[in-house]
C-alpha cells in the first residue's frame, strides 16, 4: 500500500489539515482546565486528571488509551511536622525561622493540598552549624572555595543559590565537599528580571516565592528502588540504603526574603569576585559563620520529609499506523506538577491535548498515519522522570526494535521571545524545513516564516543564515528514550532572550505562583506562542509518522561528529606534554569520523535514487535511518553511569540539564591535572577514545550498503 491509501485526504493537504485544526483557543481552555488545582504525583487529584485525559483522548478518536501504573519511591513533607530553617543563639533558642509556606496568589487562598516548598528526597535531619555561602554550588565554585580560598566545607551547612546547573548536582557537590546540610535559595540576580514587577503584578518572583524540586542523582535509573526494571506488582525492591541517587544530607529550599536574613549576617571571607555576588542587599561574604556580633549564632535545619512507595499513572494513547503499525513515533510530556503547573507542565500538556484532538479529527475523517503514533501523559516527572522511565523499562524490547522517534512535550513556554529546539542531528533538516513552512508569531515578523524570526533572534554560532539548535541534555522525559535506548529525540518550546535575560529558567519556576493567570496575563495572552509550539511539535510528529522516507539526514550527524571531535581534541591538547608522554592519539577517532562522513554521503545519494515503490527496499532504507541513533548506544554504558549509554551525547556530569559531547572522553579529561595517578588517568582517556572511535565506525557501517 502507498502511505495514503487509507485516507480520504489528499497527500499534500494532510499536514495542512492537521495544522489548520490546531486552535489557540482550545489550548487556552485546556490549560485552564489543567491548572485549577494541584496535580502532585502520587495524589488522588493527579489520578483523577489521568482518568480525565484517558476519557478525553478516547473521545478525540484514538484507537486505544490505557493507564500504565507503577509503584515508585516518592517524597513528601510531613503534614504535621513542617520543614524549616532557624538561626539559633548560643542558648539554642530560635531567633529567626524561615517561612513554612508561600503566601498563596490572589484567588487561590482557599485551595487545599498545596505542598509547601521542599527538596524532594531530602533525608530527615536537624543539623546545626556555621554557614558557608558556595555561590551556585557548581564544581568550579567548590574548586574556588577549596583550592583557591582554602575554605573547608566539612561539617558546615552550605547555602547555594539556584541556577546555572541542576539542583541535584549542587547537592552532590556539597556532599562531596563534606557539608552536613544544604540550603537552596532563589537569588534575585537569577530570578528577578530588571524592571518587571513581582507576581501578581508581573512575572517576577516575589520574596516569599520558593522553587521546589527533586535533588536526586539518578543518572537515568528511574525509580530509585528498581533500577533497570519496571516498578510493577512483582518487582524486587532495593532497601533504602541501596537505593539509587538519594542524597545523604538534609536539603531545603527558601525564598530570597528568608535568604536575606541568613546571608546578611555572614562573616569570614569576602566573595572572591563579582560573579559570586547576587542581587540581595548583603555583602555575599562566604563565611564560614556569622560576623562579629553574631558569631555565636548558628543555623539549624529541621527536615522531616518522608520517602514513600506510591502508585503513579501514565496515560498511553495509540493511533495505529496504516502501513507500518510496528513503527512507533512517540509524543510525550508529563502531567504531574509541583503545584498548579501553569507553565510546567500544563502549558505542554495542553498542547499535547490539542495535538491529540487534531489527529483524532483527521482519523474520524478516515485518515491514518503511515506509522503508529503513541501519545503519553507521564506521571512523576518532577520526582526524577519516573513515569516515562518505568514505562520505557517495561517496554524496552519493543521500543528498541520499533522506536522511530520521541518528541518531548513539557512546558511549551519559558519566555515569549523566540523558538528553542534541542534535538538529535538527525532531526535538524526536519526542523528547518518545518519551520520554513510555519508562520512566525513574533511581533515585527508578520507574514514571515518561523524559520526567519528564529534565525534572526537565535542565530547558529557556526552556520550563518541558520538557527541555533542545541544538544539534548536531560532533566526531562526524553532521557530514557535518547540516552538509554538510542531513539532519535527532540524537543521544542518558546524561550526568553538569553542575551538580555540572564536569569535561570523563568522566575516563577516550580513555585505556587506558576498559575494559569501567569500565562494568560503576562506570557501569552493570545496563546499564539502555544499555538506555534503545537505546530512545531505536532508537525514534527506528523512528518515522522507520515513521510514515506523518514525525515532524517545522516549527513548532519557527520558534521557534528567532526565538530565534537575537534572540540574534545582541543581540550586534550591543553596537555601536550602528557599526550606525548602517554602516547595519546585521536587519529582513530578522526579516521572514524571521516569514514562516517563518506559513508553518510553515499547513503544520502542512494536515498535520493532508490525505488520508493519497492516496499522491501523502502523499509530497509528506513530501518537504516531508524537504527542509526541506536548504533551510538554502548550496551555497557558510560563509566559509573550504566543508564547513560549514548556515546556521542550524555547529560553533563556537572549539570544534568546540559548535554555533553563525547562524554566518556570529556569526563576522563576533566580536571586530569589533579589526578593522583596520571598514568592511570591518561590510560582511561585512551580507552575512551577507543570506545568513541569504535562506536562511530560501527555506526558508519550500519549505513553501508547491506551487501
Amino acid at each position: 500500500k502507498s502511505s495514503n491509501e487509507a485516507t480520504n485526504i489528499t497527500p499534500k493537504h494532510n499536514m495542512k489539515a492537521f495544522l489548520d485544526e490546531l486552535k489557540a483557543e482550545n489550548i487556552k481552555k485546556f490549560l485552564y482546565n489543567f491548572t485549577q488545582i494541584p496535580h502532585l504525583a502520587g495524589t488522588e487529584q493527579n489520578f483523577q486528571l489521568a482518568k480525565q485525559i484517558q476519557s478525553q483522548w478516547k473521545e478525540f478518536g484514538l484507537d486505544s488509551v490505557e493507564l500504565a501504573h507503577y509503584d515508585v519511591l516518592l517524597s513528601y513533607p510531613n503534614k504535621t511536622h513542617p520543614n524549616y530553617i532557624s538561626i539559633i543563639n548560643e542558648d539554642g533558642n530560635e531567633i529567626f525561622n524561615t517561612s513554612l509556606f508561600e503566601p498563596p496568589p490572589p484567588g487561590y487562598e482557599n485551595v487545599s493540598d498545596i505542598v509547601p516548598p521542599f527538596s524532594a528526597f531530602s533525608p530527615q535531619g536537624m543539623p546545626e552549624g556555621d554557614l558557608v555561602y558556595v555561590n551556585y554550588a557548581r564544581t568550579e565554585d567548590f574548586f574556588k572555595l577549596e583550592r583557591d580560598m582554602k575554605i573547608n566545607c566539612s561539617g558546615k551547612i552550605v547555602i547555594a543559590r539556584y541556577g546555572k546547573v541542576f539542583r541535584g548536582n549542587k547537592v552532590k557537590n556539597a556532599q562531596l565537599a563534606g557539608a552536613k546540610g544544604v540550603i537552596l535559595y532563589s537569588d534575585p540576580a537569577d530570578y528577578f528580571a530588571p524592571g518587571v514587577k513581582s507576581y501578581p503584578d508581573g512575572w517576577n518572583l516575589p520574596g516569599g516565592g520558593v522553587q521546589r524540586g527533586n535533588i536526586l542523582n539518578l543518572n537515568g535509573a528511574g525509580d530509585p528502588l528498581t533500577p533497570g526494571y519496571p516498578a510493577n506488582e512483582y518487582a524486587y525492591r532495593r532497601g533504602i540504603a541501596e537505593a539509587v541517587g538519594l542524597p545523604s544530607i538534609p536539603v531545603h529550599p527558601i525564598g530570597y526574603y528568608d535568604a536575606q536574613k541568613l546571608l546578611e549576617k555572614m562573616g569570614g571571607s569576602a566573595p572572591p569576585d563579582s560573579s559570586w555576588r547576587g542581587s540581595l542587599k548583603v555583602p555575599y561574604n562566604v563565611g564560614p559563620g556569622f560576623t562579629g556580633n553574631f558569631s555565636t549564632q548558628k543555623v539549624k535545619m529541621h527536615i522531616h520529609s518522608t520517602n514513600e512507595v506510591t502508585r503513579i499513572y501514565n496515560v498511553i494513547g495509540t493511533l495505529r499506523g496504516a502501513v507500518e503499525p510496528d513503527r512507533y513515533v512517540i509524543l510525550g510530556g508529563h502531567r504531574d506538577s509541583w503545584v498548579f503547573g501553569g507553565i510546567d507542565p500544563q502549558s505542554g500538556a495542553a498542547v499535547v491535548h490539542e495535538i491529540v484532538r487534531s489527529f483524532g479529527t483527521l482519523k474520524k475523517e478516515g485518515w491514518r498515519p503511515r506509522r503508529t503514533i503513541l501519545f503519553a501523559s507521564w506521571d512523576a516527572e518532577e520526582f526524577g522522570l519516573l513515569g516515562s522511565t518505568e514505562w520505557a523499562e517495561e517496554n524496552s524490547r519493543l521500543l528498541q526494535e520499533r522506536g522511530v522517534a520521541y518528541i518531548n512535550a513539557d512546558s511549551s513556554i519559558e519566555g515569549n521571545y523566540t523558538l528553542r529546539v534541542d534535538c538529535t542531528p538527525l532531526m535538524y533538516s526536519l526542523v528547518h524545513n518545518l519551520t520554513k513552512e510555519l508562520k512566525s508569531p513574533d511581533e515585527g515578523f508578520e507574514g514571515k516564516s518561523l524559520y526567519e524570526s528564529w534565525t534572526k533572534k537565535s542565530p547558529s554560532p557556526e552556520f550563518s543564515g541558520m538557527p541555533r539548535i542545541s544538544k539534548l541534555g536531560s532533566g526531562n522525559d526524553f532521557e530514557v528514550f535518547f540516552q538509554r535506548l538510542g531513539i532519535a529525540s527532540g524537543r521544542a518550546r518558546y524561550t526568553k532572550n538569553w542575551e538580555t535575560n540572564k536569569f535561570s529558567g523563568y522566575p516563577l519556576y516550580h513555585s505556587v505562583y506558576e498559575t494559569y493567570e501567569l500565562v494568560e496575563k503576562f506570557y501569552d495572552p493570545m496563546f499564539k506562542y502555544h499555538l506555534t509550539v503545537a505546530q512545531v511539535r505536532g508537525g514534527m510528529v506528523f512528518e515522522l509518522a507520515n513521510s514515506i522516507v523518514l525525515p532524517f539526514d545522516c549527513r548532519d550527524y557527520a558534521v557534528v561528529l567532526r565538530k565534537y571531535a575537534d572540540k574534545i581534541y582541543s581540550i586534550s591538547m591543553k596537555h601536550p606534554q602528557e599526550m606525548k608522554t602517554y602516547s595519546v592519539s585521536f587519529d582513530s577517532l578522526f579516521s572514524a569520523v571521516k569514514n562516517f562522513t563518506e559513508i553518510a554521503s553515499k547513503f544520502s545519494e542512494r536515498l535520493q535514487d532508490f525505488d520508493k515503490s519497492n516496499p522491501i527496499v523502502l523499509r530497509m532504507m528506513n530501518d537504516q535511518l531508524m537504527f542509526l541513533e541506536r548504533a551510538f548506544i554502548d550496551p555497557l554504558g558510560l563509566p559509573d553511569r550504566p543508564f547513560y549509554r549514548h556515546v556521542i551525547y550524555a547529560p553533563s556530569s556537572h549539570n544534568k540539564y546540559a548535554g555533553e559531547s563525547f562524554p566518556g572522553i570529556y569526563d576522563a579529561l576533566f580536571d586530569i591535572e589533579s589526578k593522583v595517578d596520571p598514568s592511570k588517568a591518561w590510560g582511561e582517556v585512551k580507552r575512551q577514545i577507543y570506545v568513541a572511535a569504535f562506536t562511530v565506525q560501527a555506526a558508519a557501517e550500519t549505513l553501508s550498503e547491506v551487501a
Epitope: 530588571p194 514587577k197 542581587s279 542587599k281
Partner: antibody, heavy 123, light 108 residues
Framework: EVQLLESGGGLVQPGGSLRLSCAAS????????MGWVRQAPGKGLEWVSS????????YYADSVKGRFTISRDNSKNTLYLQMNSLRAEDTAVYYC????????????????WGQGTLVTVSS | DIQMTQSPSSLSASVGDRVTITCRAS??????LSWYQQKPGKAPKLLIY???NLESGVPSRFSGSGSGTDFTLTISSLQPEDFATYYC??????????FGGGTKVEIK
C-alpha cells in the same frame, strides 16, 4: 496615568505642626510603598520617610525621627506626613514619591513624583 | 549610614558633548544605584535604576555603569533639554535611601 498630588504645605512657626497629604491615582495604591523626599531651597534632595504598601512598616531619617509620622489610608489612596515640632531647617519643598518596586527587596528608587508642596518654617 | 559623593558638583558642556558624572559610595552597594534628573522648579525624574537599567521612556543617550562603590552616568551626546541637575541615590542600605549632592550640568 499615574498622578501624585501633594497638599497641606504653607507657612508655620517653629514648634508648630502641619499635615501634608498626597492623593494618588492611576495605579493600585496598596501594591506600592510610598515615601516623602524634601529639598531645601537651593539644596539637594533628602529622603525623609517611607511606608510599606500595607502601611505596616514605617521608616524615618534621623533628622525627623520622633517628630514626623508617615501614614496612609489605602481606602482613600492617600499618603500623609504629620509634621510636629517643626524647625527652621525643615523648610523645604516636600515631594511625595512612589516606590518603583524595581528592587526585589527593601525600598527602591522612586519612579513617580508629585509636583511638591512648599513648607516654610519661620517666625 | 552610607554616604554618596558626586563629582563634579557642576560642569559646563556644549550640545553634542559626551558628559560623564561619577558617584562614589562610602561602602559597597552592589548595583543598587539610581540616577535622577531635575530641572528648576520641577520634580526629579528617574533615569536609571540598578546601575545600568534605563527607565522606560528615557532616551538611549543616557547610560549607567558600575558596581560596588564606583558608578558613572554618561550622556553620549548632550542635547539642549539635558541641561539640568543630576542626582545619584543608593537603595542598598534602605532606609535611609541617601542621595548624592548633585551635579549641575550648565551650557558652556
Amino acid at each position: 496615568e499615574v498622578q501624585l498630588l501633594e497638599s497641606g504645605g504653607g507657612l508655620v512657626q517653629p514648634g508648630g505642626s502641619l499635615r501634608l497629604s498626597c492623593a494618588a491615582s492611576g495605579f493600585t495604591f496598596t501594591s506600592y510603598a510610598m515615601g516623602w523626599v524634601r529639598q531645601a531651597p537651593g539644596k539637594g534632595l533628602e529622603w525623609v520617610s517611607s511606608i510599606s504598601g500595607s502601611g505596616g512598616s514605617t521608616y524615618y531619617a534621623d533628622s525627623v525621627k520622633g517628630r514626623f509620622t508617615i501614614s496612609r489610608d489605602n481606602s482613600k489612596n492617600t499618603l500623609y506626613l504629620q509634621m510636629n515640632s517643626l524647625r527652621a531647617e525643615d523648610t523645604a519643598v516636600y515631594y511625595c514619591a512612589r516606590d518603583s518596586g524595581y528592587d526585589p527587596i527593601g525600598f527602591s528608587p522612586s519612579d513617580y513624583w508629585g509636583q511638591g508642596t512648599l513648607v516654610t518654617v519661620s517666625s | 549610614d552610607i554616604q554618596m559623593t558626586q563629582s563634579p558638583s557642576s560642569l559646563s558642556a556644549s550640545v553634542g558633548d559626551r558628559v560623564t558624572i561619577t558617584c562614589r559610595a562610602s561602602q559597597s552597594i552592589n548595583r543598587y544605584l539610581s540616577w535622577y534628573q531635575q530641572k528648576p522648579g520641577k520634580a526629579p525624574k528617574l533615569l536609571i535604576y540598578a546601575s545600568s537599567n534605563l527607565e522606560s521612556g528615557v532616551p538611549s543617550r543616557f547610560s549607567g555603569s558600575g558596581s560596588g562603590t564606583d558608578f558613572t552616568l554618561t550622556i553620549s551626546s548632550l542635547q539642549p533639554e539635558d541641561f539640568a541637575t543630576y542626582y545619584c541615590q543608593q537603595s542598598y542600605s534602605s532606609p535611609p535611601l541617601t542621595f548624592g549632592g548633585g551635579t549641575k550640568v550648565e551650557i558652556k
